[in-house]
Interface confidence: low
């Protein structure tokens, strides 16, 4: 079937359109194009005879049409009037006529639109704005864009006038956006430039920052006011209702309690004519004074005096804090706080209570600390110590003794020899001593503040001959595998060599034996019963030597697992049962017996005369060493058979 296709169907003015013929019959005579839906000679555009290849223009020919051999028609420089139907009349060679109609539509190429507005500065919540898309164009579709998005659904947005007009009712600040309109027809689409809607709004209720409403005297007050507004607001400050200044910020340096009050910020928008205010109440608190500590006793005596430290000044509704040595107060029965925490009492002061002490006044803005206070605790003197610790000296050497006693204030020292005052110094020096310098040397320490005195007496022996030494022990009854024992050779003497013997032999090499303190001390670690020997120490110098009496180490051990004798376990009826129990132990253990779990006698020997089969059972010997706190036991089974029933049985004793 003969058909006409319009390419394109929608044609822009000034462009061209091709009316393309499909299924053109063969053996044609010619064809002719007409404007309209039917063949009308008055509206012929052009005719073509194939045989002559002659094209003949018709009444409707405009000079813009070109006919092709395949019967298609090209129309150039399309005008609006070209819109409509076109009919092709085909005359076949057999003069059979055939017709086909096609059509196209002509649209103008749209101009770039623009937006007109009925209100350039609408006021929020009051005005409406009508945007109109210009120009008005026939057969055009109008579209709107807000911030390059299609229009949101909103009851405040209304399209009218064929969508050419966009009305915003009761504008809000959120309507401040980029608006564009777009015109469309089938052949073109054009978008306008952006129009920014300038919504006048505010001022909103201003916000005053910072939010803090409490200040301390002496601080700077710096308040800033802000209110959302277009155009930007003009600001005024009022204090207690009195105008201060027309600025966005209010600055008052070095405020006092008198600056407490209501602070009002007023924001004004000259375009909307609106005013809004916000009030904040500022409270200025007086700065608490720096605290200080008073004491009821500036020179307390150790173990005698109590000291009450008071945090000054007394302020109502204030929390008092205390620190000792930069730490919070330790828990101690000697430290007592008053109900209001203002007074800290130290009961029975010690030398360790010197401090420093600090008190603080706390408010929720800060903690104010006092200066530290140090207690001058009077103590001592303690028992003086005389050094060096030697008690034996050789004639001809220098004797230099030093005395020290812990004391506050520092002790005053005096030396006495055999009760006679010598000198008031901390050190005593005697050169080139002789045997006559032997005696009792007393150091006396005196605390002038407390009035207390303490003395220490040391026996000094000056002799060319060394004395007979003796052995002291730190543990007279060590327990095996548990205790260590330290033997010390006395006395301590200058320029002296110390030697040790065990059972008359020099010391064996053993990791459990250790010499220290210039060989003066012999330590036995983890003593065993084999260490229960005779220990002798010796001292010697260039002119003499001497040995101590032996000291025998009494090692407590055991009880070991006991042994029951005789070893027999089978007896004949009628025999005597005589069991003896023995356990190695120092001191000797306590023995007890149990037969079949039933306690018997507390003896080392268990004797039962004329036993019978009723005496069958378990015989247990229990041993206990009260000194080591250890126990042990052994169990033996005894079988008693009737007389003559079994050969080889013991007849008993």
């Amino acid at each position: 079937k003969l058909t006409i296709e319009s390419t394109p169907f929608n044609v822009a003015e000034g462009k061209e359109v091709l009316l393309l013929v499909h299924n053109l019959p063969q053996h044609l005579f010619g064809y002719s194009w007409y404007k309209g839906e039917r063949v009308d000679g008055n509206r012929q555009i052009i005719g073509y005879v194939i045989g002559t290849q002659q094209a003949t223009p018709g009444p409707a020919y405009s000079g813009r049409e070109i006919i092709y051999p395949n019967a298609s028609l090209l129309i150039q420089n399309i005008i609006q009037n070209d819109t409509g139907f076109y009919t092709l009349h085909v005359i076949k060679s057999d003069l059979v006529n055939e017709e086909a109609t096609g059509q196209f539509r002509v649209y103008p190429e749209l101009p770039k639109p623009s937006i007109s507005s009925n209100n350039s500065k609408p006021v929020e919540d009051k005005d409406a704005v009508a945007f109109t898309c210009e120009p008005e164009t026939q057969d055009a579709t109008y579209l709107w864009w807000v911030n390059n998005q299609s229009l949101p659904v909103s009851p405040r947005l209304q399209l009218s006038n064929g969508n050419r007009t966009l009305t915003l009712f009761n504008v809000t600040r959120n309507d401040t956006a980029s608006y564009k309109c777009e015109t469309q027809n089938p052949v073109s689409a054009r978008r306008s430039d952006s129009v920014i809607l300038n919504v006048l709004y505010g001022p909103d209720a201003p916000t005053i920052s910072p939010l803090n409403t409490s200040y301390r005297s002496g601080e700077n007050l710096n308040l800033s006011c802000h209110a959302a507004s277009n155009p930007p607001a003009q600001y005024s400050w009022f204090v207690n209702g009195t105008f201060q200044q027309s600025t966005q910020e209010l600055f008052i340096p070095n405020i006092t309690v008198n600056n407490s009050g209501s602070y009002t910020c007023q924001a004004h928008n000259s375009d909307t004519g609106l005013n809004r205010t916000t009030v904040t109440t500022i409270t200025v608190y007086a700065e608490p004074p720096k605290p200080f500590i008073t004491s009821n006793n500036s020179n307390p005596v150790e173990d005698e005096d109590a000291v009450a430290l008071t945090c000054e000044p007394e302020i109502q509704n204030t929390t008092y804090l205390w620190w000792v040595n930069n730490q919070s107060l330790p828990v101690s029965p000697r430290l007592q706080l008053s109900n209001d925490n203002r007074t800290l009492t130290l009961l029975s002061v010690t030398r360790n209570d010197v401090g420093p002490y600090e008190c603080g006044i706390q408010n929720e803005l800060s903690v104010d600390h006092s200066d530290p206070v140090i207690l001058n605790v009077l103590y001592g003197p303690d028992d003086p110590t005389i050094s060096p610790s030697y008690t034996y000296y050789r004639p001809g050497v220098n004797l230099s003794l030093s005395c020290h006693a812990a004391s506050n204030p520092p002790a005053q020292y005096s030396w006495l020899i055999d009760g006679n005052i010598q000198q008031h110094t901390q050190e005593l020096f005697i050169s080139n001593i002789t045997e006559k310098n032997s005696g009792l040397y007393t150091c006396q320490a005196n605390n002038s503040a407390s009035g207390h005195s303490r003395t220490t007496v040391k026996t000094i022996t000056v002799s060319a001959e060394l004395p007979k030494p003796s052995i002291s022990s730190n543990n007279s009854k060590p327990v095996e595998d548990k205790d260590a024992v330290a033997f010390t050779c006395e006395p301590e003497a200058q320029n002296t060599t110390y030697l040790w013997w065990v059972n008359g032999q020099s010391l064996p090499v053993s990791p459990r034996l250790q010499l220290s303190n210039g060989n003066r001390t012999l330590t036995l670690f983890n003593v065993t019963r084999n260490d229960a020997r005779a220990y002798v120490c010796g001292i010697q110098n260039s002119v003499s030597a001497n040995r101590s009496d032996p000291v025998t180490l009494d090692v407590l051990y055991g009880p070991d697992t006991p042994i029951i004798s005789p070893p027999d376990s089978s007896y004949l009826s009628g025999a005597n049962l005589n069991l003896s129990c023995h356990s190695a132990s120092n001191p000797s253990p306590q023995y007890s017996w149990r037969i079949n779990g039933i306690p018997q006698q507390h003896t080392q020997v268990l004797f039962i005369a004329k036993i019978t089969p009723n005496n069958n059972g378990t015989y247990a010997c229990f041993v206990s060493n009260l000194a080591t706190g250890r126990n042990n036991s052994i169990v033996k089974s005894i079988t008693v058979s009737a007389s003559g029933t079994s050969p080889g049985l013991s007849a008993g004793a």
Epitope: T281, Y285, T319, W322, Q362, N363, E364
Partner: antibody
């Protein structure tokens, strides 16, 4: 959002003990003073005790002094009230409340919903 | 200890009325006085602190005044939600409360 949640209330016999807890959130507990207030049935509010931010300072009403102990654990954001030697007149709703951080601990700006303590044989 | 005396102990009023509650301290407490509102089954709520400072979020119809020993809480125009019990509290030591004023609907 500031929240104070009391727990530990209940029925206890005269002479008995009870420990109330108050779990705090939504503010810096370790720097806030805290307190306990109670309201006996048919009576008005009675301040019971308060404690400083670092447990340095504690204060008690005369009616509970020597029997009640206020304490806090800043690591757990929890306030406690240990109540010993309880009496019938201690029966009340006990509220945990916060003193604001500024300017001084002089008012109670946030309160819990309370926990009921009933002392009865 | 400082004693706080509130008056009246109860009060009947209508919506829209102006209401005044007074609190007297047995000795001067400067401006360390607070006002609280309590409703049945609910926690007390701070209204006014430091005698006259309005707590954040409290309607401006509530106001406080006074210093020393005599203090006043004023509700300028009673609203239905204002019917409750009101307590003053001094912030000395201890922080004692007044005995309360019950505000009822007339």
């Amino acid at each position: 959002e500031v929240q104070l949640l009391e727990s530990g209330g209940g029925l206890v016999q005269p002479g008995g003990s009870l420990r109330l807890s108050c779990a705090a959130s939504g503010f810096t507990f370790s720097s806030s003073y805290m307190g306990w207030v109670r309201r006996a049935p048919g009576k008005g509010l009675e301040w019971v005790s308060s404690i400083g931010s670092g447990s340095y300072s504690t204060s008690y009403a005369d009616s509970v002094k020597g029997r009640f102990t206020i304490s806090r654990d800043n690591s757990k954001n929890t306030l406690y009230l240990q109540m010993n030697s309880l009496r019938a007149e201690d029966t009340a709703v006990y509220y945990c409340a916060r003193y604001p951080s500024v300017p001084f601990p002089l008012h109670l700006d946030y309160w819990g919903q309370g926990t009921l303590v009933t002392v009865s044989s | 200890d400082i004693q706080m005396t509130q008056s009246p102990s109860s009060l009947s009023a209508s919506v829209g009325d102006r209401v005044t509650i007074t609190c007297r301290a047995s000795q001067s407490i400067s401006s360390y006085l607070n006002w609280y509102q309590e409703k049945p089954g609910k926690a007390p709520k701070l209204l006014i602190y430091a005698a006259s400072s309005l707590q954040s979020g409290v309607p401006s119809r509530f106001s406080g005044s006074g210093s020393g020993t005599d203090f006043t809480l004023t509700i300028s125009s009673l609203q239905p939600e204002d019917f409750a019990t009101y307590y003053c509290q001094q912030a000395g030591n201890p922080h004692t409360f007044g005995q309360g004023t019950k505000l009822e609907i007339k």
